[in-house]
């Protein structure tokens, strides 16, 4: 399973799914243009499963208010796209298995390299 590779525009919604991962426990994002969001390079956790109730979204991250679970766990997420979201989303399993979704947001390469 090669994972997903999705295209979208700011303002669109895309579904991120966790194909082939038996017990998803967290999602991690590696931005293509980290400086666009004032971030450093590398992967960062964006959501993880809670023991009970709603999944946990860290308060100081770019997806607050734009990311929601579409099922009772975190197997399927819906993301409202914003400029600078391009990157790879990893769904991590309890047994260190993972799936990945590569996201390209229209215009990010230009938007994120523009001065200011």
């Amino acid at each position: 399973n090669p994972g997903a590779s999705l295209d979208g525009r700011p303002g669109d919604r895309v579904d991120l799914s966790c194909g082939g991962v038996s017990h998803p426990i967290r999602w991690v994002w590696a931005p293509s243009f980290p400086a666009c969001k004032g971030l450093s390079k590398g992967r960062r956790p964006i959501l993880w499963a809670a023991a009970a109730g709603a999944p946990t979204v860290p308060p100081l991250q770019p997806f607050v208010g734009r990311l929601r679970s579409l099922d009772s766990g975190i197997r399927r997420l819906e993301l409202l796209l914003s400029a600078g979201d391009s990157g790879t989303f990893f769904c991590k399993g309890r047994h260190e298995d993972e799936s990945r979704t590569v996201l390209h947001v229209l215009g990010d390469r230009t938007y994120c390299k523009a001065p200011g």
């Epitope: 999705l6 979208g8 525009r9």
Partner: antibody, heavy 119, light 107 residues
Framework: EVQLQQSGAELVKPGASVKLSCTAS????????IHWVKQRPEQGLEWIGR????????RYDPKFQGKATITADTSSNSAYLQVSSLTSEDTAVYYC????????????WGQGTSVTVSS | DIQMTQTTSSLSASLGDRVTISCRAS??????LNWYQQKPDGTVKLLIY???TLHSGVPSRFSGSGSGTDYSLTISNLEQEDVATYFC?????????FGGGTKLEIK
């Protein structure tokens, strides 16, 4: 009205290259992805690749990598497909089309350009 | 690459019939499935995107359904103008891939 107007039919010799054009009206190509799709005679549709015209970010089916090059000129609201080292396998109708992204399909298509490779 | 299979390459039906065209993906494509109509003159139009959403201007006799790897397009009341070839296409991962097409004719 959304329209994609493609250039006229081409008759080209083996080994040559051809550059096809696609001019958009009724929308700004910078706000969409532009795709190119190939259809050989009596065959199905094959996705060649797509470009984000705002940043010239192209992606291709690996089987067309090195064979096809997609470019765009946002000032003329046009996209282009160049096919190189032509052989009889490249004889086909080539369609340009637009998409807003994976969730929306390829929502408007050009009329197609016929390319015939013959000596 | 994800393979898209339309097992019926051609079918014939009568005016007014309900026709279903099926499409199978080689892996789960999470509903990123679109349907196109190609008329005999080569004109291509989007009918349905994201499994079941009707594109603007498409008659309501067209509908789509499915999930996972199995999808279908239904024409509920066949009309003469529906004579065409129908293609499914996945947008779940690159490269985007099409089914081989189903040619629909009137009996």
């Amino acid at each position: 009205e959304v329209q994609l107007q493609q250039s006229g039919a081409e008759l080209v010799k083996p080994g040559a290259s051809v550059k096809l054009s696609c001019t958009a009206s009724g929308f700004n190509i910078k706000e969409t992805y532009i795709h190119w799709v190939k259809q050989r005679p009596e065959q199905g549709l094959e996705w060649i690749g797509r470009i984000d015209p705002a940043d010239v970010y192209g992606r291709y089916d690996p089987k067309f990598q090195g064979k096809a090059t997609i470019t765009a000129d946002t000032s003329s609201n046009s996209a282009y497909l160049q096919v190189s080292s032509l052989t009889s396998e490249d004889t086909a109708v080539y369609y340009c089309a637009r998409s807003y992204g994976s969730s929306y399909g390829i929502d408007y298509w050009g009329q197609g350009t016929s390319v015939t490779v013959s000596s | 690459d994800i393979q898209m299979t339309q097992t019926t390459s051609s079918l014939s039906a009568s005016l007014g019939d309900r026709v279903t065209i099926s499409c199978r993906a080689s892996q789960d494509i999470s509903n990123y499935l679109n349907w196109y109509q190609q008329k005999p003159d080569g004109t291509v139009k989007l009918l349905i995107y994201y499994t079941s959403t009707l594109h603007s201007g498409v008659p309501s006799r067209f509908s789509g359904s499915g999930s996972g790897t199995d999808y279908s397009l239904t024409i509920s009341n066949l009309e003469q103008e529906d004579v065409a070839t129908y293609f499914c296409q996945q947008g779940y991962t690159l490269p985007w891939t099409f089914g081989g097409g189903t040619k629909l004719e009137i009996k």
